[in-house]
């Protein structure tokens, strides 16, 4: 079932989720100067059954300037490397997403796609934040959001995290400075902003997740 | 919360042209494709068109080219569709509805008559 | 275009029984499918995404299923607030069509 809203709002941080519960659609949108193809697929669904969940449907992006002309899904070794994953900041031994039984790996990159991904979570899903750079995080426990279904309506978990100005003194000693990592703030309703830039979490927060969701890439 | 509002009721003469508003609120309008769909008793529904305010892109079907015309004003997150050369055959429900995760207005009742 | 077909346009039950209200398409549509149900002088109120997915707030008593062709819309343990009209739609090839419409009568 879809999550009627976004994952709460943290100033000064982002969220990220590691793995997409099976239900969760991504949105076809292209960058500027493209456009989804006429019958082309209006959003990826992350489906499939215990044993194997999978993205259903391929994102198709078109020059807005030429009509019919349908650009090849397949990524540009240019936009790889733009695009390139990242290695989980974590000490547990992570686990392959595409072997956790009812979730999906973040979808591959499309040609031409937009800047910025639109996830539909659905009821379950899990994601974590980060503050951004120049922040650090204070804990007050996990620094993590659920979409949990309460009395037939939705509603996201108040994640426990203070991000800071590193000028500021923590309460919280022995915090290590975040990683890097852009500003990508939600917006409303159950869209969900994820800019496709490298995004790290840090050691202390993956210590907070739970090991099966871990993976080894991801945007 | 997601809202689509349109007005409740339009009424025309034959010949002449209308512009029906949906003016969208709780969620990025420029990000999403916004449809329109015409209902008739006894004709079903129908998908007119859409529109991606973030580019202005349109889609149409082929049935209605020539008789509407989809516009968005971000400023206003507000999508219009303008329907030309009216006939009592145009008498419809028009809803607007984002494309997706869906979402649908309350409709607008157009009468042409004379 | 693709064509719809909701070969029953009423169908009769009784409070507390299940009832299926299926939908053809003309060619493969994958599932990429939509139900809808729609109240007198309301607008249509979306309930299942992608043949088998629930909108949030959508009660469990209402499952989608289907794929290829043929879909089914199923509310068990029907109850008066069901009495509706209820769409399919396809999304998988540009224009998007309806089915005609099945209403839900309760006895």
């Known amino acids: 079932e879809l999550c009627d809203d976004d994952p709460p709002e943290i100033p000064h941080a982002t969220f990220k989720a590691m793995a997409y519960k099976e239900g969760t659609m991504l949105n076809c949108e292209c960058k500027r100067g493209f456009r989804r193809i006429k019958s082309g697929s209006l959003y990826m669904l992350c489906t499939g059954n215990s044993s194997h969940s999978s993205w259903d449907n391929q994102c198709q992006c078109t020059s807005s300037a030429t009509r019919n002309t349908t650009k090849q899904v397949t990524p540009q070794p240019e936009e790889q490397k733009e695009r390139k994953t990242t290695e989980m900041q974590s000490p547990m031994q992570p686990v392959d997403q595409a072997s956790l039984p009812g979730h999906c790996r973040e979808p591959p990159p499309w040609e031409n796609e937009a800047t910025e991904r639109i996830y539909h979570f659905v009821v379950g899903q899990m994601v974590y934040y980060q503050c951004v750079q120049g922040y650090r995080a204070l804990h007050r426990g996990p620094a993590e959001s659920v979409c949990k279904m309460t009395h037939g309506k939705t509603r996201w978990t108040q994640p426990q995290l203070i991000c800071t100005g590193e000028m500021e003194t923590s309460q919280f000693p022995g915090e290590e400075k975040p990683q890097a990592s852009p500003e990508g703030r939600p917006e409303s309703e159950t869209s969900c902003l994820v800019t496709t830039t490298d995004f790290q979490i840090q050691t202390e927060m993956a210590a907070t997740m739970e090991t099966s969701i871990f993976t080894t890439e991801y945007q | 919360q997601i809202q689509l509002q349109q007005p409740g009721a339009e009424l025309v003469r034959p010949g002449t042209s209308v512009k029906i508003s949906c003016k969208a609120s709780?969620?990025?309008?420029?990000?999403?494709?916004l449809g329109w769909v015409k209902q008739r008793p006894g004709h079903g529904l129908e998908w007119i068109g859409d529109?991606?305010?973030?580019?202005?892109?349109?889609n149409y079907n082929e049935k209605f080219k020539g008789k509407a015309t989809l516009t968005a004003d971000t400023s206003s997150s507000t999508a219009y569709m303008q329907l030309s050369s009216l006939t009592s055959e145009d008498s419809a429900v028009y809803f607007c509805?984002?494309?997706?995760?869906?979402?649908w207005g309350q409709g607008t009742s157009l009468t042409v008559s004379s | 275009d693709i064509v719809i077909t909701q070969s029953q346009k009423f169908m009769s039950t009784s409070v507390g029984d299940r009832v299926s209200v299926t939908c053809k398409a003309s060619?493969?549509?994958?599932?990429?499918v939509a139900w809808y149900q729609q109240k007198p002088g309301q607008s249509p109120k979306a309930l299942i995404y992608?043949?088998?997915y629930r909108y949030s707030g959508v009660p469990d008593r209402l499952t989608g299923s289907g794929s290829g062709t043929d879909f089914t819309l199923t509310i068990s343990n029907v109850q008066s607030e069901d009495l509706a009209e209820y769409f399919c739609?396809?999304?998988?090839?540009?224009?998007?069509?309806f089915g005609g419409g099945t209403k839900l009568e309760i006895k």
């Open positions: 509805a984002r494309v997706t995760p869906a979402s």
């Open positions: 709780g969620y990025t309008f420029t990000n999403y494709w």
């Open positions: 529109i991606y305010p973030g580019g202005g892109y349109t």
């Open positions: 060619q493969n549509v994958g599932t990429n």
């Open positions: 992608s043949a088998s």
């Open positions: 739609q396809q999304y998988n090839r540009y224009p998007y069509t």
